[in-house]
Amino acid sequence: QNASRGRRQRRMHPNVSQGCQGGCATCSDYNGCLSCKPRLFFALERIGMKQIGVCLSSCPSGYYGTRYPDINKCTKCKADCDTCFNKNFCTKCKSGFYLHLGKCLDNCPEGLEANNHTMECVSIVHCEVSEWNPWSPCTKKGKTCGFKRGTETRVREIIQHPSAKGNLCPPTNETRKCTVQRKKCQKGERGKKGRERKRKKPNKGESKEAIPDSKSLESSKEIPEQRENKQQQKKRKVQDKQKSVSVSTVH
């Protein structure tokens, strides 16, 4: 009898601090913690139909701690926010939302794109390429001598790869026709290899450059040089220098 009266009495006077759990300063049988020990945050935990007060050293996910003179309490972040500093500054959004300026958005504003890895709105990055490197030596079947017409190539590097919505990279290779130096090849002379022969393998994710090989260039409409007089040859050489053939795969 006495025991039951005691229990009833405790319910009528909920601010009983005897037998409080963990960090509670005051508590009740029905409501759990009513106040917390210094520096601990008060939070309400839903258990079935009722809410129980608990005292925590830090607030759970979706809440942030605020210290008032009379209570340190856990306050809910905005509905779309997973972790926050306060109501104004979310630091991690819930799934399906992107973080931008401390806010959670379902779509990123114009001029920004969604980074699905960090779940943030980030600036669109456009492709940046270097200046063209010098033209390679003019070669024909790998030789830099003879009277044949050959090809020369130049390349440039990608300095900044574009992000998903960024401008694609322009061609990084150019090939054009040229006239090989007018000198007879010595018997067994091996020509200097052109730059395009030495080209590195393309980076992962880059497609191979569609550079025609010397055979395909050779088969393009060509009047044999023997039929041309020197004056015509000179004229043709100038025209060919101006006719730059750009062949490349866009990155």
């Epitope: 942030y64 605020t66 210290r67 008032y68 003179p69 009379d70 500093f85 306060n86 109501k87 104004n88 500054f89």
Partner: antibody
């Protein structure tokens, strides 16, 4: 865009009263704790009072307790500071601000001069 | 009340300089510290919260460090628009208090 606009400042004699208002827009006013912060001419910043989001609790610095009352009308998106028994040392620019640990958004301020 | 003491009270520097402002608390405030910038005739503007978390839009030349009672605000390379008064603020305890300010002037 968050906007806080203070009004009600002016020149007042010591012992008299003044009521400052702060009109809020661009955010859900009723979700935010609000505060008044003041700055005496050529001096630093000084927190004056805070009212929690629903108006149920208020906090004051010791020097204004019993003289100043912070209140809010969430239906009008307006914060108030009723200042009674004004003293020369209350002379300052009074700013209203959102107060959620830090003072994130501020108004442009209103000048209160207490002088005989 | 927790007292915050900033040093120096004023500081002259040139564009491009690296500048450090310190804020010392009279007791442990853990990491509950913010920094504000105020220009003449304007309201303060929040720069940093939780010692070192930069507000979005604040240039990365601003950084904060420290814990407990000693904190610093560093501007790695001063720009003309950085000349202003800087305040620290603690929110570990009521009343929330500010430092007295550090006025950063052009040399």
């Amino acid at each position: 865009e968050v906007q806080l606009v203070e009004s009600g400042g002016g020149v007042v004699q010591p012992g008299r009263s003044l009521r400052l208002s702060c009109a809020a827009s661009g955010f859900t006013f009723s979700d935010y704790d609000m505060a008044w912060v003041r700055q005496a001419p050529g001096k630093g910043l000084e927190w004056v009072a805070t009212i929690i989001y629903d108006g149920s609790r208020t906090y004051y610095r010791d020097s204004v307790k019993g003289r100043f009352t912070i209140s809010r009308d969430n239906s009008k998106n307006t914060l108030y500071l009723q200042m009674n028994s004004l003293r020369a040392e209350d002379t300052a620019v009074y700013y209203c601000a959102t107060h959620d640990k830090t003072f994130d958004y501020w108004g442009q301020g209103t000048m209160v001069t207490v002088s005989s | 009340d927790i007292q915050l003491t900033q040093s120096p009270s004023s500081l002259s520097a040139s564009v491009g300089d690296r500048v450090t402002i310190t804020c010392r608390a009279s007791e442990d405030i853990y990491s509950d510290l913010a920094w504000y910038q105020q220009k003449p005739g304007k309201a303060p503007k929040l720069l940093i919260y939780d010692v070192n978390s930069l507000i979005h839009g604040v240039p990365s030349r601003f950084s904060g460090s420290g814990s407990g009672t000693d904190f610093t605000l560093t501007i790695s390379s001063l720009q003309p628009e950085d000349f202003a008064t800087y305040y620290c603020q603690q929110y570990d305890n009521y009343p929330n208090t500010f430092g007295q300010g550090t006025k950063l002037e052009i040399k």
